[in-house]
Amino acid sequence: VPRWRQQWSGPGTTKRFPETVLARCVKYTEIHPEMRHVDCQSVWDAFKGAFISKHPCNITEEDYQPLMKLGTQTVPCNKILLWSRIKDLAHQFTQVQRDMFTLEDTLLGYLADDLTWCGEFNTSKINYQSCPDWRKDCSNNPVSVFWKTVSRRFAEAACDVVHVMLNGSRSKIFDKNSTFGSVEVHNLQPEKVQTLEAWVIHGGREDSRDLCQDPTIKELESIISKRNIQFSCKNIYRPDKFLQCVKNPEDSSCTSEI
């Protein structure tokens, strides 16, 4: 008799999830010599232990604590790049500007990027059929709690000038309900962080508006100012040229506004 299985509203665990996490860990430790001491089997065991045999709507930050310990890493606190709804460009930027880090440039972020996972209460099985959706099912699911935990810790670690890349093509350039708006903004430490500098990325080639005047950016400025952190904002009118100029800053066309 087939066992009854909870049907959730979200997609199930990414196929070959254990193999993917393990392979990513091995690859990361090979690329980053300072992490070569990491035991990837222990990392996988800690990751698995955070959600296996637990109800996927009852996951806590504490469940991920063993994984956090194994992911200990040096991140220059003044070289942190946050992003919201514009992940690809943020990652392209840090691939060129190698001294800056997004969360996904760390081991823990790299392991989980774009993956979905969940288990089932009282069984050691991974659920490949469905996982809880944050809105339709529950917020304390394995994926959401993981990203909330590492995002909070990443923001807490930041200092001096923190940069955030925002998508100027969206109706809400700053969205209070995004991970950046709901977690990271509120966990920047005013005693360590002097300024939050927003980079608003324009989508249209002919878009010359000053999106730093957008009402949602003004809302972000208000939230940040109330936390005793200074705020600044820059328009990136030409993201393609922006990346090109990061690669080749000596280029004569890079002195003009981008």
């Epitope: 194994l70 810790r153 200092c159 360590k192």
Partner: nanobody, 117 residues
Framework: EVQVLESGGGLVQPGGSLRLSCAAS????????MSWVRQAPGKGLEWVST????????DYADSVKGRFTISRDNSKNTLYLQLNSLRAEDTAVYYC??????????RGQGTLVTVSS
């Protein structure tokens, strides 16, 4: 600006003890969890222990549990790590850092602990 200065390291025989100190400045010390991390020669960064801002909550790596004790004196802006029953594998540079990790940017020079007979 967050600044820390670690001290108290040295050469000690296996089974011996040391007390490390970390003097912190540039921030409201009691508002921040603080951690000890270490780096053994030729190895990566390893988290050792964390203590909450008020000192009421502590956590330890399995490898040091029962042997090391973290504490703090908020009136002196100082963090401590008592190292007992030291082993050769505890040989490392010990750093204190603000926060609970896993992302650390240690600001001090660290203090070297060498366990050898």
């Amino acid at each position: 600006e967050v600044q820390v200065l670690e001290s108290g390291g040295g050469l000690v025989q296996p089974g011996g003890s040391l007390r490390l100190s970390c003097a912190a400045s540039g921030f409201t010390f009691s508002n921040f969890a603080m951690s000890w991390v270490r780096q053994a020669p030729g190895k990566g960064l390893e988290w050792v222990s964390t203590i909450s801002g008020g000192g009421g909550s502590t956590d330890y790596a399995d490898s040091v549990k029962g042997r090391f004790t973290i504490s703090r004196d908020n009136s002196k802006n100082t963090l401590y790590l008592q190292l007992n029953s030291l082993r050769a594998e505890d040989t490392a540079v010990y750093y204190c850092a603000d926060g609970r990790g896993p992302f650390f940017d240690y600001r001090g020079q660290g203090t070297l602990v060498t366990v050898s007979s």
